[in-house]
Interface confidence: medium
């Protein structure tokens, strides 16, 4: 499988466990992968009684279920950790939960941050 039309080179990066894992807390991540593999961005978060707790954001390597998704939309009904993936630079900046059961769509807007580039 070659590159998709929306080629992903950079994603929003975030790590809630940045201190423990000795990484930056937030910024931009340059995506790198094998020549014939596609690249995606992802976001993962928890929802505790309506309070959104961002877990991680970043690059995500060649995943069939992320192909050709321009927006980051989680469809799992009520998981411990919500997850979405998408294709296109910084497509994981905004992320949405749209459960299959047809509940209300909830879109999460990121707070403005000063990005630092991760390589």
């Amino acid at each position: 499988s070659g590159r998709g039309e929306a080629e992903t080179r950079e994603c929003i990066y975030y790590n809630a466990n940045w201190e423990l894992e000795r990484t930056n807390q937030s910024g931009l991540e340059r995506c790198e992968g094998e020549q014939d593999k596609r690249l995606h961005c992802y976001a993962s978060w928890r929802n505790s009684s309506g309070t959104i707790e961002l877990v991680k954001k970043g690059c995500w390597l060649d995943d069939f279920n992320c192909y050709d998704r321009q927006e980051c939309v989680a469809t799992e009904e009520n998981p411990q950790v919500y997850f979405c993936c998408c294709e296109g630079n910084f497509c994981n900046e905004r992320f949405t939960h749209l459960p299959e059961a047809g509940g209300p769509e909830v879109t999460y807007e990121p707070p403005p941050t000063a990005p630092t580039l991760l390589t």
Partner: antibody, heavy 118, light 112 residues
Framework: QLVESGGGLVRPGRSLTLSCTAS????????MHWVRQAPGKGLEWVSG????????AYADSVKGRFIISRDNAKNSLYLEMNSLRAEDTAVYYC?????????????WGQGTSVTVSS | DIVMTQTPVSSPVTLGQPASISCRSS???????????LSWIQQRPGQPPRLLIY???NRFSGVPDRFSGSGAGTDFTLKISRVEAEDVGVYYC?????????FGQGTKVEIK
Amino acid sequence: QLVESGGGLVRPGRSLTLSCTASGFTFNDYAMHWVRQAPGKGLEWVSGISWNTNSKAYADSVKGRFIISRDNAKNSLYLEMNSLRAEDTAVYYCVRDGGRFYYGLDVWGQGTSVTVSS
Amino acid sequence: DIVMTQTPVSSPVTLGQPASISCRSSQSLIHSDGNTYLSWIQQRPGQPPRLLIYKISNRFSGVPDRFSGSGAGTDFTLKISRVEAEDVGVYYCAETSQVPHTFGQGTKVEIK
């Protein structure tokens, strides 16, 4: 729920199209796969298709002979099998791709049997 | 492609006793995101396969807690703490993080 159909007895070199009808979930949110099982043998991944049909992948053993497709409006997955060989004899399962982050191959159909014999 | 090898091929077990199945991959299954996408699939006689365990050790919905998965890197294990009659069947390990998905050759669990 996934229900396969279209299997049967077919002569070598002929064609057959398998269908899979999905219910109980939003079909067009998921990539889908075909996995087969020859009599008395293990599981073999055959082909996969992305949610919007833009990306398709095939096992080397069927590349150039089989075509995977889907119709999201009909909640249906298809496998067009051409130039069939005796070694294509198997039960063919339609399988939902629950997503790598979550479960992987999480919903399986009952399977449809294909026998290639003269 | 990744090759998955299971041992033993067959495992005769006494009811109520434990059973253990090993799976080894030809290369590390640790993904760049830190997760390992190794699943275990059960196939009872005459039935279609069904997902038991995902991401090494997570039980899928409805799977009894006598089933557990462990391992890392290239070596993985499925354990049944106390085998019941309904556990008879073939168990497959599967690598599902990339296409082509690859399966182990299967381990048959049968009652002695």
